[in-house]
Interface confidence: low
């Protein structure tokens, strides 16, 4: 099972009970060796290839259960065929077994008399047959065969009875790994339910973070949702704030500018007329009326109607009416009332911290109170009880195990020398029969008649026949073991072994009323007394192998129902409860009249109605009527040439002072157009649309004051809502999580499972009955080998 | 325009007390904005210290909590930090700034005094 | 409480290239509440970029920056001498209330 999921719970918030860690294996690896196990199980399919006979044994256990059986009825009679039937495969080698054993002795017998009135074989022909020795060949040939077939099996009695040997004395370690298991089950436990009610401090302490921080978490959430509604209209208000700081400079620079240029104007006109005169003056030099100097004082005396300053510079009008509206514009901080208005949107997390104290410390009071409720909770959990009387069964069957461990390997001692003794004896025939090939084969003489033939070859036919003689003496006592370990053998892997490990074992044993007539659940009536609750051996088997917890796999809540007593909703309602009682007053300051009286007399303050085109019109003329340097120029190059003297001189001493004029009077003036320029362009932008501008703001204002009129509650209270929804997402993830492990993870009773595993899987089939499966299958597999390797033999 | 001047002792003996002022000219500390104190440490990092609101209250840095105390003078336009028990780790520039918490600089700094160099 | 990590440490660019520094944060951020500093030796921090990506007063327009979550940058366009400085970033937070900076980038002529 994954972790519960809480739709409010964060993600990360995640609670992971600590991994117990058991010793003993899930599973037991055979190893190479299990390659022969598997070969004796296609072996054991051949034989007995039908389903596990699950109604039968049902019938059979209930016939069993019975106090007298009667044998004549047509239902214990048809029982009895329908388990021939089942063994049939077993029944059959079995009779063959029986045959085996009652008529090798008696052959051997009857050979044995007959061999002593010289009358099967051992005669001695002076003449070969033709066909002698290849007959000879053919015989040897099967023989060695025969032989490699014996030794296989011998091979597998070897293994079998080694692996019974060391399995078992690996089975002393396997009990005490699984019952370490068994007691770490026992001893976590206690543990896993302090680990459980640890972290109620883990959710009381996130939760007592965020109830601290509920100026930040609340409130920061109040104002994220009121901050785009507000914040825009603000900034505009700022913007505009800015605008009528700018227009006042603009417009006090535009006046400053139009009385310096009135000035300069004036001083240029002064300074032109002075020029002029002092010109005219010049041009009376008797010099100007004799050729060719007169037509150069004719050409200065006509450009000096071109010495004139521009008259409508000092005409254009101040803007002191506009300056003065825009003062009185200032006289209202708009800047300082934009910041209050950020100012109380700053200030909401504070005011929620501020008016939240008594609720938060009502939340905290019931989050102590719910801590308590838990620890009584786990206290009456039934695990408990049930593991204590578990713990007893646990101890008892320690004792038991290790009382009678010593026992069981003296046992399997006996069983380790008995089967080398087998395996041994069926060696020793064997041997006698490679021997007496390998001497045959070697001391052959085709020349050599039967009575001048060699001792090596003697000795090979003395050795065959001390063979055969062994053969006739033993085959038919090892027969007998290989039947006898066989019936048993077979029959528990088909009876125990596979139909556990594929469950249909469990099955049989889930049969209602079968282990116990008035129980239709063993299980839940042995140990609840309650026989009608559905609990079975393999959902039991299946739910510990999975590593559930106890409650959950026993189907404790029917005892104890755990979700009742935690009562999550009793618990997240006390906290909703308090949580109602949550109430916050926000006062968010928006401008007020000062402010909008302010806006819309800077609509009203006439910058957009001032004459622009008129103040932009001079700045692009020339203060003077013509260039002054370039006039200064040609002045002095038509003074150069006139010949030197008084008006020579006087002329450049002129051009000079056209020069100076042009730096000290022109350029300052048109440095002051230049800044009249950029200041008529700023008001000409501020200007532009201005009313437009002011009503649009004045609407946002509307708006925003409308919003925080009408929403700022249902924020409010949505919020709220949002914030005690993570306060309980907390507590309801917490619990469900205490429902979750407890029913799932608490008391993982996998160990159990294993334990019945360790006896069954492990410790029956895998180390008893699959070596002693590999014993009859390999010795019987010699012994009956041993008819044909006899016959050939001879 | 606004300025801000910090002032105060170059030099502290451990477990003393640190005190420094920080003049404001150009604007009345109460009205408005946050006034900080942040400290550089001669590894460049920075670190703030704490403010005083334009309405007089506190906000300081956790780590520091126990040991810090910043106050006012509304007549004088001035700011002071008191840290106690200094060690040599609080070697370090300290400045004094001004948060500008509304649109549009969010809890930006604004304007910085030019430092003061304080060595434990 | 969130850290704000930034990368590179010292970073040295040519003139005219384009240089880019990252701000990471441990946790998201507001973008509202991610500004910019610049530091020259001897003198004190600047209000570089304001609210993640506006430019203070008298920043020149090569200056850019951006991000959200929990990363943020700043961009120079095309680097130029006067741009050599330690740059920092900085984000306020809400709970517990805080002041975090960066450790700063120090930015210098290849």
């Known amino acids: 099972g994954g972790q519960p999921s809480s739709t409010d719970a964060p993600k990360a918030w995640n609670y992971e009970l600590p991994a117990t860690n058991y010793e003993t294996q899930d599973s037991h690896k055979a190893g190479p060796i299990g390659i022969l196990f598997e070969l004796v199980h296609i072996f054991l399919y051949v034989v007995q290839p039908r389903d596990f006979p699950e109604d039968t044994l049902r019938k059979f256990l209930q016939k069993a259960y019975e106090s007298k059986i009667d044998y004549d009825k047509p239902e214990t009679v048809i029982l009895g065929l329908k388990i021939v039937y089942y063994e049939a495969g077993i029944i059959l080698c079995c009779v063959l077994g029986l045959l085996f054993i009652i008529l090798m002795p008696l052959v051997g017998y009857f050979f044995c008399m007959c061999r002593c009135c010289n009358k099967c074989g051992g005669e001695m022909h002076q003449r070969q047959k033709e066909n002698g020795p290849f007959l000879r060949k053919c015989f040897a040939i099967s023989l060695l065969v025969i032989c490699i077939i014996i030794s296989i099996g011998i091979f597998y009695g070897f293994v079998a009875n080694h692996q019974v040997r060391t399995r078992i004395k690996r089975s002393r370690k396997l009990a005490d790994s699984n019952f370490k298991d068994l007691r770490t089950l026992l001893n976590e436990t206690p543990e896993q339910i302090k680990y459980i009610l640890a972290q109620y401090n883990t959710t009381k302490d996130k939760a007592f973070t965020d109830l601290n921080s509920i100026n930040s978490v609340l409130g920061g959430g109040i104002l994220d949702r009121l901050r785009p509604n507000i914040i825009p209209v603000l900034d505009e208000i700022k913007s505009m704030a800015t605008a009528i700081k700018e227009t006042k400079e603009a417009l006090e620079n535009m006046n400053s500018t139009l009385k310096s240029l009135h000035q300069q104007s004036t001083q240029l006109s002064s300074s032109l007329t002075s020029v002029k005169t002092s010109l005219r003056s010049s041009l009376n030099d008797p010099l100007c009326l004799v050729h060719p100097s007169s037509e150069t004082c004719n050409s200065i005396r006509l450009s000096l109607s071109q010495l004139n300053s521009n008259p409508e510079l000092r005409q254009l009008p101040p803007v002191d009416a506009e300056l003065d509206n825009v003062n009185n514009v200032l006289r209202t901080d708009l800047d300082g009332l934009v910041q209050q208005g950020y100012q109380s949107l700053n200030d909401i997390p504070d005011r929620v911290q501020r008016q939240t104290t008594t609720v938060v410390a009502g939340i905290k009071r019931v989050l102590n109170s719910i801590g308590s409720d838990i620890d009584n909770v786990t206290q009456r959990l039934p695990i408990q009880d049930i593991l204590s009387a578990f713990s007893v069964y646990v101890n008892n069957t320690e004792s038991y195990i290790h009382r009678n461990l010593p026992t069981l390997e003296e046992y399997d001692s006996y069983w380790w020398l008995g089967g080398l003794v087998i395996c041994s004896l069926l060696t020793l025939i064997v041997i006698f029969y490679y021997l007496g090939l390998l001497c045959g084969v070697c001391g052959y003489d085709r020349h050599a008649t039967p009575t001048t033939r060699g001792c090596v070859s003697n000795t090979g036919g003395v050795f065959l026949m001390v063979g055969v003689g062994l053969s006739f003496l033993f085959c038919w006592i090892l027969m007998i073991i290989v039947v006898l370990t066989f019936v048993f053998g077979a029959n528990v892997e088909k009876l125990i072994c596979e139909p556990y490990t594929s469950k249909e074992l469990f099955r049989v044993l889930d049969t209602p009323y079968l282990l116990n007539e008035d129980w239709e659940y063993y299980l839940s009536g042995k140990l609840f007394n309650k026989s009608k609750m559905k609990l079975t051996f393999e959902q039991v088997y299946s739910d510990c192998k999975k590593n559930r917890g106890t409650y959950g796999t026993l189907h404790l809540q029917n005892s104890f129902n755990i979700s009742e007593h935690l009562n999550i909703n009793e618990h997240t309602g006390s906290i909703s409860s308090e949580l109602e009682s949550l109430k916050v007053n926000l006062n968010i300051f928006l401008l007020g009249a000062a402010g909008r009286k302010n806006l819309q007399d800077f609509a009203a303050c006439g910058i957009d109605r001032m004459n622009y085109d008129s103040y932009l019109a001079q700045t692009g003329k020339s203060p003077a009527g013509v260039n002054l340097l370039s006039f200064a120029y040609d002045l002095e190059a038509k003074a150069n040439s006139l010949p030197p003297g008084n008006l020579r001189n006087s002329l450049k001493r002129d051009a000079q002072t056209i020069k100076t004029i042009h730096q000290q009077r022109v350029l300052p003036i048109e440095q002051s157009l230049s800044t009249l320029y950029q200041s008529v362009k700023i008001l000409q932008r501020t200007g532009n649309g201005l009313l437009e501008r002011v009503t649009r703001i004045l609407a946002s204002l509307d708006f925003a004051q409308n919003f925080i009129t009408n929403n700022t509650s249902s924020v409010i209270i949505e919020e709220t809502k949002k914030y005690g929804r993570t306060i309980i997402g907390y507590f309801e993830h917490y619990l469900q999580w205490i429902e979750f492990s407890i029913s799932e993870k608490v008391a993982s009773c996998k160990p159990v499972a294993t334990a019945l595993d360790t006896a069954v899987d492990v410790f029956l089939c895998s180390y008893i009955i699959d070596p002693l499966n590999l014993f009859w299958f390999g010795i019987g597999k010699a012994t009956v080998f041993l008819l044909p390797a006899l016959i050939f033999a001879v | 325009d606004v300025q801000l001047q910090e002032s105060g002792p170059g030099l502290v003996k451990p477990s003393q007390s640190l005190s420094l002022t920080c003049s404001v000219t150009g604007y009345s500390i109460t009205s408005g904005y946050y006034w900080s104190w942040i400290r550089q440490f001669p590894g460049n990092k920075l670190e703030w210290m704490g403010y005083i609101s334009y309405d007089g209250s506190n906000n300081y840095n956790p780590s520091l909590k126990n040991r810090i105390s910043i106050t006012r003078d509304t007549s004088k336009n001035q700011i002071f930090l008191k840290l106690n028990s200094v060690t040599t780790e609080d070697t370090a520039t300290y400045y004094c700034?001004?948060?500008?918490?509304?649109?549009?600089?969010?809890?930006?700094?604004?304007?910085w005094g030019q430092g003061i160099s304080v060595t434990v | 409480q969130i850290v704000l990590t930034q990368s590179p440490a010292i970073m040295s660019a040519s003139l005219g290239e384009r240089v880019t520094m990252t701000c990471t944060a441990s946790?998201?951020?507001?973008?509202?509440?991610l500004h910019w500093y610049r530091q020259k030796p001897g003198s004190s921090p600047k209000l570089w970029i304001y609210?993640?990506?506006n430019l203070a007063s008298g920043v020149p327009a090569r200056f850019s920056g951006s991000g959200s979550g929990t990363s943020y940058s700043l961009t120079i366009s095309s680097m130029e001498a006067e741009d050599a400085a330690t740059y920092y970033c900085?984000?306020?937070?809400?709970?517990?209330?805080?002041?975090?900076f960066g450790g700063g980038t120090k930015l210098e002529i290849k």
């Open positions: 700034t001004r948060v500008y918490f509304g649109h549009p600089y969010y809890y930006g700094m604004d304007y």
């Open positions: 900085h984000q306020y937070h809400r709970s517990p209330y805080m002041y975090m």
């Open positions: 609210s993640t990506s």
């Open positions: 946790s998201s951020v507001s973008s509202f509440y």
